[in-house]
Each structure stands twice: as structure tokens, then as C-alpha cells.
């Protein structure tokens, strides 16, 4: 988890100002209105190899 202004969240996650921590972009399927989901739209998901080993 990152503080604002430091290194970005890990791949597949995005910073939530509301929750003050990095959140998994995968959760945007269930909660698309979450503040961090805007950041997820611009970021790629986790590497392909992690999902299809």
C-alpha cells in the first residue's frame, strides 16, 4: 500500500483516496463506482502470465 505522492500502486491495483490505500482493480467488476476504478481504466490488468500460467 502506498501513500499519495510516493511510488504508484502495484500492477492491477489503483490508489483509493476514500480508503487511503491501494485497491485491486478486479473489485471494480462488483463496485464500478469506486473512486479508484477511474485509475484502473487507464492501467493494464495483472500480467497475462499470472492469469494464464
Amino acid at each position: 500500500e502506498q501513500a499519495p505522492g510516493t511510488a504508484p500502486c502495484s500492477r492491477g491495483s489503483s490508489w483509493s483516496a476514500d480508503l487511503d490505500k491501494c485497491m485491486d482493480c478486479a473489485s471494480c467488476r462488483a463496485r464500478p463506482k469506486s473512486d479508484f476504478c477511474l485509475g484502473c481504466a487507464a492501467a493494464p490488468p495483472a500480467p497475462f502470465r499470472l492469469l494464464w500460467p
Epitope: 480508503l19 478486479a26 473489485s27 467488476r29 463496485r31 463506482k33 469506486s34 495483472a46 492469469l51
Partner: antibody, heavy 119, light 111 residues
Framework: QVELVESGGGLVQPGGSLRLSCAAS????????MSWVRQAPGKGLEWVAE??????????HYAESVKGRFTISRDDSKNSLYLQMNSLRAEDTAVYYC??????????WGQGTLVTVSS | DIQMTQSPSSLSASVGDRVTITCRAS??????????MHWYQQKPGKAPKLLIK???NLESGVPSRFSGSGSGTDFTLTISSLQPEDFATYYC?????????FGGGTKVEIK
């Protein structure tokens, strides 16, 4: 430090009622979906009920096995979750866990409270 | 409802062994980007603890010897080098739809 503390379990006769409570602390309760998950003695985990947020009009969902008998509710002002259990059956005997999660995976779990339905 | 089939139901292993547990869903629980499968560890008399979410994302504080993989219907939890504190029961769970369902559990015992 996240903490979920269940209470209200005990021995109840078949057909009886019980109300479980879960007191939450250490996270933004009002932003998290909450569920009850149960575990019968020596058995696996079974999801029971879920309640979402105020912005979702506190939408609720239930397992078929408890629909019409159990009611899940929450009080965000008290950081508390509840499970009203009516028409209890022997097969409802289990440890009941309160769980919290933003979505999908259940991040936070209480220690559980035992409900025994027996005559 | 989506059925979750875990195998084996129990296994005996020694400290240092590599352990693999599998979970099969009765239908796909993945999108093109993410898999809605999670793994928990439960020790006797204790509440379950989340280990891995979205098939492969290790929870904060969980040792790196735990890893998860898979997509679609077939998923795997691997413990690369079993430690004494890893003897427990492990459950998979999907969050693709309501009702959420868990696998039957895999009990990892000391050989």
C-alpha cells in the same frame, strides 16, 4: 487493528429464534460489504447472507437454505452487523462468522459464535 | 449455483515438501482480465484467514511460499516449502455470483 467480535450465540430449541451481533472496529465499516458465513461441526464453510451499502439501499442476499427464515441487517452508526434467525432447525447448528470485505474476497473475519439448535 | 470441487480432501506431507491443492469450478469464474477465485487457511478452533485473492494476489503479510494460479474453471494453491505452521485446512471460494460457494476443504496433515 481490524476486529470483528460476534455475540449472541447459544443453545436454542428447534423452531426458536436467536439474534447474532457483530461489532466491528479498525476499518471503515460503512464502506464494506458484510456477510455471515457458517461452519457446522467438523464440516466446511457455507456462506449464509450478505448486506451491501447505504448507497446500494442496503441490498441483501441469502443462501437458499436460510431464505425466509434469516434476516441480515447493519447499523453503520454503531459499526454493527446483525443476523436475526427464526424457525431454527437442527441443521442450522454451526459456528457463525461475521466477515467484512470491499468486494469479492473476505478480508476480515470474526472469531465466530456457536449456535446449537437442539431439544 | 457454481459448485466448487477441491482435491485432494486431505493429504499428508512433511516439512519442506511442495504441496499443491486444486479447485475446480463448475463454470468459469474468470473474465479476460481477472479470476474471481480466493483461497483461505483455517487452523483448528480458529477463523479462516484470507491467503490469496483473485486467483494469484497474495494478501499482505502472507509468506511468499504461498502462491496461486489458474483461470476459467481450474485453480491451484501451491505451498513451495511446507512449514510447521502451514498444517491446516485450506478452502477455495468464488465470488463470481451469488451465492458465493466454498470448496469442501483440503486438510494438510503431518506425515
Amino acid at each position: 487493528q481490524v476486529e470483528l467480535v460476534e455475540s449472541g450465540g447459544g443453545l436454542v430449541q428447534p423452531g426458536g429464534s436467536l439474534r447474532l451481533s457483530c461489532a466491528a472496529s479498525g476499518f471503515t465499516f460503512s464502506s464494506y460489504w458484510m456477510s455471515w458465513v457458517r461452519q457446522a461441526p467438523g464440516k466446511g464453510l457455507e456462506w449464509v447472507a450478505e448486506i451491501r451499502l447505504k448507497s446500494d439501499n442496503y441490498a441483501t442476499h441469502y443462501a437458499e437454505s436460510v431464505k425466509g427464515r434469516f434476516t441480515i441487517s447493519r447499523d453503520d452508526s454503531k459499526n454493527s452487523l446483525y443476523l436475526q434467525m427464526n424457525s431454527l432447525r437442527a441443521e442450522d447448528t454451526a459456528v457463525y462468522y461475521c466477515t467484512g470485505y470491499y468486494a469479492d474476497a473476505m478480508d476480515y473475519w470474526g472469531q465466530g459464535t456457536l449456535v446449537t439448535v437442539s431439544s | 449455483d457454481i459448485q466448487m470441487t477441491q482435491s485432494p480432501s486431505s493429504l499428508s506431507a512433511s516439512v519442506g515438501d511442495r504441496v499443491t491443492i486444486t479447485c475446480r469450478a463448475s463454470q468459469s469464474v474468470s473474465t479476460s482480465s481477472y479470476s474471481y477465485m480466493h483461497w483461505y487457511q483455517q487452523k483448528p478452533g480458529k477463523a479462516p484467514k484470507l491467503l490469496i485473492k483473485y486467483a494469484s494476489n497474495l494478501e499482505s503479510g502472507v509468506p511468499s511460499r504461498f502462491s496461486g494460479s489458474g483461470s476459467g474453471t481450474d485453480f491451484t494453491l501451491t505451498i513451495s516449502s511446507l512449514q510447521p505452521e502451514d498444517f491446516a485446512t485450506y478452502y477455495c471460494q468464488h465470488s463470481w455470483e451469488i451465492p458465493y460457494t466454498f470448496g469442501g476443504g483440503t486438510k494438510v496433515e503431518i506425515k
